[in-house]
């Protein structure tokens, strides 16, 4: 029950996280015009990964896409790549984790297969979250660097008289959405990995097996049960049996086609 809850919660948290990463990637407000200590202008500039926008006080908003690929800064391209990789990995992870959910039965899929799929999706979520966090952090670092550079430029001019107001940019809402979403995806991935451990069948003979010996009808019980039977250490009439007899749902998990995603 705890495993199912952990897996389910991990899935939901990752789903929210990936939705957030997609939202952050699409948002226009990665960087916004810094209004602090600036002359009050009637336009508000903000930029995203794909386009830059200007909102005028009169109510008009104009957005222009970055139609060039080669002319864009390498850092921006890197951030785009990280976010897209994060989304792709997250989407594949979600797809895998849906089939891995314990509460969903698909054919005669074994628990070992589900465990492997849960682990795979968990790793994908972790990498997806890290990609998003890395992408947002790289962009934030770029902003901080540019901010201080433009601040220095603001106060250097001919005779100290500033003729052009340098537009400085600060952190936009998308950065915070990205950080939170990346964190959630990461947490979701960790939860999936934890759930995987609980799903994986262990190599212990916990099931009582009935073995009919010739001549006598003796019920053999595996020794693994002795601690919980109430018979103490009285094992005189018991024989630890480790033969090939197994119950139906304790089939040895050999590598199968379901194990590899």
């Amino acid at each position: 029950m705890a495993v199912t809850a952990c897996q389910g919660l991990g899935f939901v948290v990752s789903l929210i996280g990936i939705a957030g990463i997609i939202a952050a990637t699409c948002m226009d407000q990665w960087s916004t015009q810094d209004l602090y200590n600036n002359p009050v202008t009637a336009v508000f500039n903000y930029q995203g990964l794909w386009r830059s926008c200007v909102r005028e006080s009169s109510g008009f908003t104009e957005c222009r896409g970055y139609f060039t690929l080669l002319g864009l800064p390498a850092m921006l391209q890197a951030v785009r790549a990280l976010m897209i990789v994060g989304i792709v990995l997250g989407a594949i992870g979600l797809l895998v984790s849906i089939f891995a959910l314990k509460c969903i039965r698909i054919g005669s899929m074994e628990d070992s297969a589900k465990a492997n799929m849960t682990l795979t999706s968990g790793i994908m979520f972790i990498v997806s979250g890290l990609c998003a966090i890395a992408g947002v952090s790289v962009f934030a670092n770029m902003l901080v660097t540019n901010f201080w550079m433009s601040t220095a430029n603001m106060y250097t001019g001919m005779g100290g008289m500033v003729q052009t107001v340098q537009t400085r940019y600060t952190f936009g809402a998308a950065l915070f959405v990205g950080w939170v979403a990346g964190g959630l995806t990461l947490i979701g991935g960790v939860m999936m990995c934890i759930a995987c451990r609980g799903l994986a069948p262990e190599e212990t003979n916990y099931k009582a097996v009935s073995y009919h010996a010739s001549g006598h009808s003796v019920a053999y019980k595996p020794g693994g049960f002795k601690a919980s039977t109430g018979f103490g250490s009285n094992t005189k009439n018991k024989k630890i049996y480790d033969g090939g007899a197994r119950t139906e749902d304790e089939v040895q998990s050999y590598p199968s086609k379901h194990d590899y995603v």
Epitope: V43, Y46, S52, E56, S58, G59, V165
Partner: antibody, heavy 117, light 113 residues
């Protein structure tokens, strides 16, 4: 079509409060801003202030302490209030709709306000 | 506040003549975000409210004849009338639409010789 019409008292006594209403049609005040401009007789244009779609306002720094611009979206009305008027406030008062580039693309005909005792 | 300086204060021209008037702002009106200059030109005829001619320094308002051309960037701007017509006789104002409070130039009066 877009229309703006100013309605004012015509005559205001010195030190009184001047109140002008701008009634708009053909556009919504929740989408576009309205700006106020005045023109003393035989002189140039002076920007007074503006109220934008979101309700935020900006004022002429020299008149800020005396000016209040407000609006009623449901009535499609914008009002300008100027306290402690003097003869120097005698002018034609215009309201205008904000357009591209924060420019004023549609103007009212203006209302002449004379400050005199 | 931004100071808008217009020159000349008045000019007398013959019909069909090309005319140029200038406007200078105390700070750059260029917005780096969209590379547009927030300078507007208005025309005011006697007894009428001002009429929008040009916004973003060079974009003609719809319905404005193409003989009116706005140019310039940063702090220096120009309004050109390629061939003056009788109906162009008016006062022309430039306005800063970038920094609050918005400010007007003192105007250029266009008269017939």
């Amino acid at each position: 079509q877009v229309q703006l019409k100013e309605s004012g008292p015509g005559l205001v006594a010195p030190s009184e409060t001047l109140s002008i209403t701008c009634t708009v049609s053909g556009f919504s005040l929740t989408t576009y801003g309205v700006q106020w401009v005045r023109q003393p007789p035989g002189k140039g244009l002076e920007w007074l202030g503006a109220i934008w779609a979101g309700g935020n306002t900006n004022y002429n720094s020299a008149l800020m302490s005396r000016l209040t611009i407000s609006k009623d979206n449901s009535k499609s009305q914008v009002s300008l209030k100027m306290s402690s008027v003097t003869a120097a406030d005698t002018a034609i008062y215009y309201c205008a709709k904000g357009g591209y580039g924060n420019a004023m693309d549609y103007w009212g005909q203006g209302t002449l306000v004379t400050v005199s005792s | 506040d931004i100071v808008m300086t217009q020159s000349p204060s008045s000019l007398a021209v013959s019909l069909g003549e090309r005319v140029t008037m200038n406007c200078k702002s105390s700070q750059s009106l260029l917005n780096s975000g969209n590379q547009k200059n927030y300078l507007t030109w208005y025309q005011q005829k006697p007894g009428q409210p001002p009429k929008l001619l040009i916004y973003w320094a060079s974009t003609r308002e719809s319905g404005v004849p193409d003989r009116f051309t706005g140019s310039g960037s940063g702090t220096d701007f120009t309004l050109t009338i390629s061939s003056v017509q009788a109906e162009d006789l008016a006062v022309y104002y430039c306005q800063n639409d970038y920094f609050f409070p918005f400010t007007f130039g003192s105007g250029t009066k266009l008269e017939i010789k």
